[in-house]
């Protein structure tokens, strides 16, 4: 595959909500019209597809209606939000971009944020 | 059902413009690219260009670079092509075609073509 | 630019035999991801070309499953297990590999 830099924070740490947001940059070659982006998340040697969007450039990033995952895209920049997390969640999330069209097609794969999730203390009970 | 109908033929005098127009139905229009396809008279199929039409950003067959301007506007679903300083060996039909990202960027739907005579 | 040379140029056939159509490029289009950059399109005499083949191997919605194609990096075969008189017309490969995109020079199909 023709190989392609893609540069993503090294480290971010979730919400209270849990909710982490990170930029995943890439270095497109040429006239990149359609991009594919992937969030893979990689804990124990395990690596497992979070979501995936494809989109036109200008177009909005358009993720499953059931999917954990929103975006922004912006030139060969794309803002990445996942929602939900827990603290089992904590781990290394890596941003995969393919150019999908025109050709030829480009691979690029980041180095990956690791996300830290905190489950927030339970709210002690109060007395009304 | 998805449709591309394109503008009617056109005889022009060499070293003029043509403008070419593809309107496209029964499909979200900024979600697939056009491309452009030539045909000259009992031959064979040669790429154009194509646009995407959210940024009109375009990607061209040099042998075309400079003469084939391809333009959209998305207010009416509409795609063009114009093709400048015609020569007598533009004389063919020029076709318009939605590209699929579920068929790997293939032409799924065409237009029914449109015939451009370059002659003095 | 990648050149596809297909033959035969013309190809007589009768109704419910075997057809098919050679279509070599000049560069191997089966990618480092896995996929064919190939394609087979057929125009029907006063028609627009229509979509047959996609990825070397896949029919598109609505293609007869007597059409098979198969082949390398750069030597392909379209097949029409049983060939029907509306299978006429000009049958082109053509790749998209790396631009410009480009069609082989066409085969005629026709009843004898």
């Known amino acids: 595959c023709k190989a392609m830099h893609v540069a993503q924070p090294a480290v971010v740490l979730a919400s209270s909500r849990g909710i982490a947001s990170f930029v995943c940059e890439y270095a497109s070659p040429g006239k990149a019209t359609e991009v594919r982006v992937t969030v893979l998340r990689q804990a124990d040697s395990q690596v497992t597809e979070v979501c995936a969007a494809t989109y036109m450039m200008g177009n909005e990033l358009t993720f499953l209606d059931d999917s954990i995952c929103t975006g922004t895209s912006s030139g060969n920049q794309v803002n990445l939000t996942i929602q939900g997390l827990r603290a089992m969640d904590t781990g290394l999330y890596i941003c995969k971009v393919e150019l999908m069209y025109p050709p030829p097609y480009y691979l690029g794969i980041g180095n990956g944020t690791q996300i830290y999730v905190i489950d927030p203390e339970p709210c002690p009970d109060s007395d009304f | 059902q998805v449709q591309l109908v394109q503008s009617g033929a056109e005889v022009k005098k060499p070293g003029a413009s043509v403008k070419i127009s593809c309107k496209a139905s029964?499909?979200?229009?900024?979600?697939?690219?056009i491309n452009w396809v030539k045909q000259a008279p009992g031959q064979g199929l040669e790429w154009i260009g194509d646009?995407?039409?959210?940024?009109?950003?375009?990607n061209s067959n040099q042998k075309f670079e400079g003469r084939a301007t391809l333009t959209v506007d998305t207010s009416i679903s509409t795609a063009y092509m114009e093709l400048s300083r015609l020569r007598s060996d533009d004389t063919a039909v020029y076709y318009c075609?939605?590209?699929?990202?579920?068929?790997?960027?293939?032409?799924?739907?065409w237009g029914q073509g449109t015939l451009v005579t370059v002659s003095s | 630019d990648i050149v596809m040379t297909q033959s035969p140029l013309s190809l007589p056939v009768t109704p419910g035999e075997p057809a098919s159509i050679s279509c070599r490029s000049s560069?191997?289009?089966?990618?480092?991801?896995?996929?064919?950059?190939l394609y087979w399109y057929l125009q029907k005499p006063g028609q627009s070309p229509q979509l047959l083949i996609y990825?070397?191997?896949n029919l598109a919605s609505g293609v007869p499953d007597r059409f098979s194609s198969s082949g390398s990096g750069t030597d392909f075969t379209l097949k029409i297990s049983r060939v029907e008189a509306e299978d006429v017309g000009v049958y082109y490969c053509?790749?998209?590999?790396?631009?410009?995109?480009?069609f082989g020079g066409g085969t005629k199909v026709e009843i004898k």
């Open positions: 075609a939605r590209l699929r990202r579920e068929y790997f960027y293939a032409m799924d739907y």
């Open positions: 029964g499909y979200k229009f900024t979600d697939h690219f």
């Open positions: 646009i995407n039409p959210n940024n009109g950003g375009t």
């Open positions: 560069k191997s289009l089966l990618h480092s991801n896995g996929i064919t950059y």
């Open positions: 990825q070397m191997s």
């Open positions: 053509a790749q998209n590999l790396e631009l410009p995109l480009t």
